[in-house]
């Protein structure tokens, strides 16, 4: 169909309760383009009509509420007047049990579920809260350890909880609840967040660490687009360079002629301590010599690689 | 002893800018929240902007949304406020406060005071 | 936002007579009060915060009491240097917000 397929990473959601995600990837978003999404490489678009359970809402795909059936890989297709990019995601669906100190913690959870407060300063935890405009968020109210919070050293702005003179007692299973208000309908939202107490500034000390990949291999098609993302949390007056090498060499010195290969525009997000930094690898077009290579993530002294594979045949297929 | 010190204060007109700075001394600066508070001539107090140790949390008033900016330099014990597309209901005595408990205010500089007049 | 009302605007005393001073929010703001004095020609000084608690050095004779929406700023007898500008503060909601405050004048 002539749409380039990009994969983007895992998302761990919630059941039972309303998921957005945002069909956003610069600059293919940013000019004049038509956005439409499909569940598991189904032909027929998710629904537009608002009063369903899962449907399109702009560039988004929104989920009023999630259920344990949603998990699977949702694509949206970005057409341009001359291009048109097939984005995969793969959206995975867990039962939330906040509450219950039985289950143990949940693996891979984002910085968004795992925040840090520090000893003795004037801190604040997040509630990352996105959905699209359609969507109307009422006040945010904070627990912790399944109570509600009260108290003279806690106050709400906005989406944070602003915690005066941190102590050691303050870690543990934050929770913040919002009730969000679609077409009428009200939906609860409810996001956990594994609070750590550090005493110094710094994320790690000076060592920035990568987050992702993690010296791994990625399955890849033959002639596919694949772009794959660094990320890098460091200290916010960091120096360390961000970059993706190969042999030893610059992806964009490397593919200097062909261009196949290139390095994107670094982004970061701020955080209470420390910066996430994203930067990614593009591949046009996977070709056989990519394969077994590793394509290094480099921060500062720390590294860490992906090396590209064929996927496994199908045997179905025959 | 704790102290701050407002600087940057001057006569501007309408529609120009105008960036203020605080030296912060005696006290741990890189642990507390930072705010700007002003006092028009004669009038009571009006908080206008607040910023987190890190940078990380930063609001304001309504009255300067989209038109002022905090920031601060922790290096430097620094606090900053910069003020664009002035207005004159901007004139004020414009104080530098610690936060104490976020978002009471226990130390206080003496104040840079902002004219903005055509 | 949150208004904070204060009264009286005016408080005329003498010296050793005690000073009542009230400040009304339009909603309740819990135990997230505090109160200021201003001297002339000086910044303000942070005197009570969360309602009754003394900050650094503020003498005994100034306490604060109340809760919700209504609260009191008391100065159990006044000295000379008392006589000045007070302001309450509110930081239960964003923005924070000032009464417009009282002057105690001596009479």
């Known amino acids: 169909d002539g749409c380039k397929d990009i994969f983007m990473k895992n998302e761990i959601l919630s059941a039972s309760q309303p998921f957005a995600f945002n069909c956003t990837f610069p600059p293919i978003t940013s000019g004049e383009v038509s956005v439409t999404w499909y569940k598991n490489s189904s032909k027929i678009p998710v629904s537009k009509i608002i009063q369903s359970r899962i449907h399109q809402d702009e560039t988004w795909i929104l989920f009023l509420p999630m259920e344990w059936g949603d998990s699977g890989v949702y694509q949206c297709v970005i057409k341009g007047r001359d291009s048109c990019h097939r984005i995969h995601v793969n959206l995975t669906v867990f039962e939330k049990h906040w509450c219950d100190t039985s289950i143990g913690g949940l693996p891979n959870l984002s910085d968004e579920y795992k925040q840090i407060l520090h000893l003795g300063k004037d801190d604040s935890l997040t509630c990352h809260l996105h959905f699209p405009k359609s969507c109307v968020l009422g006040p945010i109210k904070w627990y912790k350890d399944c109570n509600e919070i009260k108290g003279e050293r806690f106050t709400v702005l906005e989406t944070r909880l602003l915690v005066s003179n941190v102590s050691a007692e303050d870690r543990g299973n934050y929770a913040c609840q919002a009730i969000l208000t679609h077409s009428g309908k009200q939906y609860e939202v409810l996001n956990g967040i594994t609070v750590s107490i550090t005493e110094r500034a710094g994320y790690g000390g000076s060592v920035p660490k990568i987050i992702y990949p993690k010296n791994h291999s990625i399955e890849v098609q033959l002639g596919t687009t694949l772009i794959v993302d660094c990320n890098v949390t460091d200290t916010k007056d960091n120096t360390n360079l961000r970059c993706w090498r190969v042999n030893n060499t610059l992806v964009d010195d490397y593919y200097d002629e062909s261009k196949r290969i290139r390095e994107g525009v670094e982004t970061h997000v701020s955080f209470r301590e420390h910066n996430l930094y994203t930067v990614n690898i593009t591949f046009l077009e996977v070709k056989m010599e990519d394969y077994g290579l590793p394509f290094m993530c480099h921060a500062g002294v720390s590294t860490a690689y992906i090396i590209l594979q064929l996927p496994a045949p199908d045997f179905r297929a025959y | 002893e704790v102290q701050l010190v407002e600087s940057g204060g001057d006569l501007v007109q309408p529609g120009r800018s105008l960036r203020l700075s605080c030296a912060a001394s005696?006290?741990?600066?890189?642990?507390?929240?930072m705010h700007w508070v002003r006092q028009a001539p004669g009038k009571g107090l009006e908080w206008v902007s607040v910023?987190?140790?890190?940078?990380?949390?930063?609001a304001y008033s309504d009255s300067v949304k989209g038109r002022f900016t905090i920031s601060r330099d922790n290096a430097k014990n620094s606090l900053y406020l910069q003020m664009n597309s002035l207005r004159t209901e901007d004139t004020a005595l414009y104080y530098c406060?610690?936060?104490?408990?976020?978002?009471?205010?226990?130390?206080w500089g003496q104040g840079t005071l902002v004219t903005v007049s055509s | 936002e949150i208004v904070l009302t204060q009264s009286p605007a005016t408080l005329s005393l003498s010296p050793g007579e005690r000073a009542t001073l009230s400040c009304r929010a339009s909603?309740?703001?819990?135990?997230?009060l505090a109160w200021y004095q201003q001297k002339p020609g000086q910044a303000p000084r942070l005197l009570i915060f969360?309602?009754?608690n003394r900050a650094t050095d503020i003498p005994a004779r100034f306490s604060g009491s109340g809760s919700g929406t209504d609260f009191t700023l008391t100065i159990s007898s006044l000295e000379p240097e008392d006589f000045a500008v007070y302001y309450c503060?509110?930081?239960?909601?964003?923005?924070?917000?000032f009464g417009g405050g009282t002057k105690v004048e001596i009479k």
């Open positions: 406060t610690k936060g104490h408990k976020w978002s009471f205010f226990d130390y």
């Open positions: 005696g006290f741990t600066f890189d642990d507390y929240a």
């Open positions: 910023i987190s140790w890190n940078s990380d949390v930063i």
């Open positions: 909603q309740s703001i819990s135990s997230y």
């Open positions: 969360n309602v009754a």
């Open positions: 503060q509110q930081r239960s909601n964003w923005p924070l917000t």
